[in-house]
Structures are given as structure tokens and as C-alpha cells.
């Protein structure tokens, strides 16, 4: 079995303020078992945007049905985008454990926010 890769096909996405942003992410393997998390930014100060395993993320919905068998699509939609949401978003695969540990990150998608059309 080939080692899992995290694919973020869009290097950048531009969204008008007030609209929803769709950030694409797929993985290439069911192995290892473990959740996906999305972050804005990298390094120790990165901001958690979505955690498949736990937490409440009212602005985030998953694009596909992540509970379904053999699902490898972990794209998300973020609603009501504002300029404060601009940044680079990383889709990160974690490996099941106690606690779950980071396994592999996507290359990132830069979100830019356009002014709301008048």
C-alpha cells in the first residue's frame, strides 16, 4: 500500500466577503486511521478551523459525507467569509493514538477575500 498523501489541489482561492469558501482536500489512502483537522497558518500559533474528531465549528461544514465508507474527501466549506479569514489553510491528517498525532499535511490553500460587491 502506498503511503498516504494529502492533496490540496488549489494553491489559492478568492472569495467575496459574505460568501462561503470551499477548501478542497482529499487523501489517497485509508491508512492510517485517524481524523482530519484544518488549520489556518502553520507552526505553533496555527489556528484550528475544524477537527473531525471533536469540537464545535458552527461556520464549517464538510462537503462530503465523511462518515461514509471509503470516504477520502475532507473538503470543507466556511460560511460568511470576512477579511479576517484571509490566510493559508492546511488540511492535516492525524494518526489514531492517545492522543492522536499529526501524520501528514497538505501543501496549503491561500484564501484571499475580495470586497463585497456593492
Amino acid at each position: 500500500e502506498e503511503e498516504l498523501q494529502v492533496i490540496q489541489p488549489d494553491k489559492s482561492v478568492s472569495v467575496a466577503a459574505g460568501e462561503s469558501a470551499i477548501l478542497l482536500c482529499t487523501v489517497t489512502s485509508l491508512i492510517p486511521v485517524g481524523p482530519i483537522q484544518w488549520f489556518r497558518g502553520a507552526g505553533p500559533a496555527r489556528e484550528l478551523i475544524y477537527n473531525q474528531k471533536e469540537g464545535h465549528f458552527p461556520r464549517v461544514t464538510t462537503v462530503s459525507e465523511s462518515t461514509k465508507r471509503e470516504n477520502m474527501d475532507f473538503s470543507i466549506s466556511i460560511s460568511n467569509i470576512t477579511p479576517a479569514d484571509a490566510g493559508t489553510y492546511y488540511c492535516v491528517k492525524f494518526r489514531k493514538g492517545s492522543p492522536d498525532t499529526e501524520f501528514k499535511s497538505g501543501a496549503g490553500t491561500e484564501l484571499s477575500v475580495r470586497a463585497k460587491p456593492s
Partner: antibody, heavy 119, light 110 residues
Framework: QVQLVQSGAEVKKPGASVKVSCKAS????????INWVRQAPGQGLEWIAM????????HYNQIFKDRATLTTDTSTSTAYMELRSLRSDDTAVYYC????????????WGRGTLVTVSS | DIVLTQSPDSLAVSLGERATINCRAS??????????IFWYQQKPGQPPKLLIY???NRDSGVPDRFSGSGSGTDFTLTISSLQAEDVAVYYC????????FGQGTKLEIK
């Protein structure tokens, strides 16, 4: 950490029904399947059914399709398994188990609920 | 339905020796590039514990003396050097279709 806490032991008469609960914590309940498995005294494991709490999709072992019903209460992160028309050979430990990889496998298990069917 | 048959039903192995448990499926459990076989360990009075998923992948925290192998219809759980705490009943399970378990193999110390 993931925890599945099951309801206490039950003693039932033949023909009665039992409803076993499984309260989940440590994860988002609607993001992972719950399986139910039973084990008769001194016997092996027997898969009963599974449920996706996000939309209540269920899959049943044909053996149990007419007698078992799985439900969930997402407000309390609790899964339920009801078994009707109980017989003495339904005496078993009933386990709930969470599928962390959507592989139709059982990653985390409750401690089990002993259901005794006796007249 | 796919039936899983484990062999042997029981097994006695000396401490430090290799233990091998087999699981044969009545038809192939390979699909989408994966072998949909899982192995569990159950000690007395405890729920089962997942050891191996998708035939050959150790679950988190499982000692590396446990390994899984096989493809298609024939699968093996191997304990490379038996420890006293490995005494248990071992079950295979498939999920190529809806899940079923093998009948179990009781592992004891010789």
C-alpha cells in the same frame, strides 16, 4: 479520550424487550458509526448491526433484522439497541463499539451490558 | 454471506515462541485495493481490543510483536515472541460486506 459507557445489567422474561444504551464522550458523536455486537456466555462474537448517528443510516445482520432496532439521541450522544421477543438464547453480553475509520470495524468498545433472559 | 473460519480453535505456545493463527474467508475480502480483515484480542472479562486493521496495519499502541499478513481469502495473525499477557481469545473480522467474525482461537501458554 473516547469513552463508551453502557447501561447496567438487565434480567428479562422470554417474549419481553430490552433496550440497552451506550453514552459516548470524547469525540463528536455524529462523525462516527456505532456498532452493536453480542457475546453469549463462553461463545464468540456476533455482529448485530451498525448506525451512523449523523443520518440514522443503519445496517443489520439479517438474523436480527426483524427483532433489533438501533436508534440514537444526538442531543445526549447516546446510542440505543432494542431487542424484542427475547428468548433464552439471547442471554449475552451486548457491546457497543465505535468505528473510528469508517471501515466497518470496531476501534473503541464499551464494557458491555449483560442481558439475562430467564423465566 | 462471507464466512470466516479460524484455525486452530485453540493453541498452546511456549513463552518466547511464535504463535500463528489463521483466518480463511469463504470468498475474497479484497476490494478497492484493501484486504478488509481485522484482528481483535479478548481477555477474560474484558471487551475485545482491535489489534490489526486492513489485514496488516497495527492499531495504535499495539506491540510490534503482533503482525498481520495475507490477501484475498487467507490471513494470518502472528505473535513473534509470546508473552504471558498475550493469553486471550483472538478473533478475525471482515468488512468486505457487512461485518462477520471468525469463531475465535484460544491462545494459551504451554
Amino acid at each position: 479520550q473516547v469513552q463508551l459507557v453502557q447501561s447496567g445489567a438487565e434480567v428479562k422474561k422470554p417474549g419481553a424487550s430490552v433496550k440497552v444504551s451506550c453514552k459516548a464522550s470524547g469525540y463528536t458523536f455524529t462523525n462516527y458509526w456505532i456498532n452493536w455486537v453480542r457475546q453469549a456466555p463462553g461463545q464468540g462474537l456476533e455482529w448485530i448491526a451498525m448506525i451512523d448517528p449523523s443520518d440514522s443510516e443503519t445496517h443489520y445482520n439479517q438474523i436480527f433484522k426483524d427483532r433489533a432496532t438501533l436508534t440514537t439521541d444526538t442531543s445526549t450522544s447516546t446510542a440505543y439497541m432494542e431487542l424484542r421477543s427475547l428468548r433464552s438464547d439471547d442471554t449475552a453480553v451486548y457491546y457497543c463499539a465505535m468505528d473510528y475509520g469508517s471501515l466497518y470495524a470496531m476501534d473503541y468498545w464499551g464494557r458491555g451490558t449483560l442481558v439475562t433472559v430467564s423465566s | 454471506d462471507i464466512v470466516l473460519t479460524q484455525s486452530p480453535d485453540s493453541l498452546a505456545v511456549s513463552l518466547g515462541e511464535r504463535a500463528t493463527i489463521n483466518c480463511r474467508a469463504s470468498q475474497s475480502v479484497r476490494s478497492s485495493g484493501y484486504n478488509w480483515i481485522f484482528w481483535y484480542q479478548q481477555k477474560p472479562g474484558q471487551p475485545p481490543k482491535l489489534l490489526i486493521y486492513l489485514a496488516s496495519n497495527r492499531d495504535s499502541g499495539v506491540p510490534d510483536r503482533f503482525s498481520g499478513s495475507g490477501s484475498g481469502t487467507d490471513f494470518t495473525l502472528t505473535i513473534s515472541s509470546l508473552q504471558a499477557e498475550d493469553v486471550a481469545v483472538y478473533y478475525c473480522q471482515h468488512s468486505r460486506e457487512l461485518p462477520t467474525f471468525g469463531q475465535g482461537t484460544k491462545l494459551e501458554i504451554k
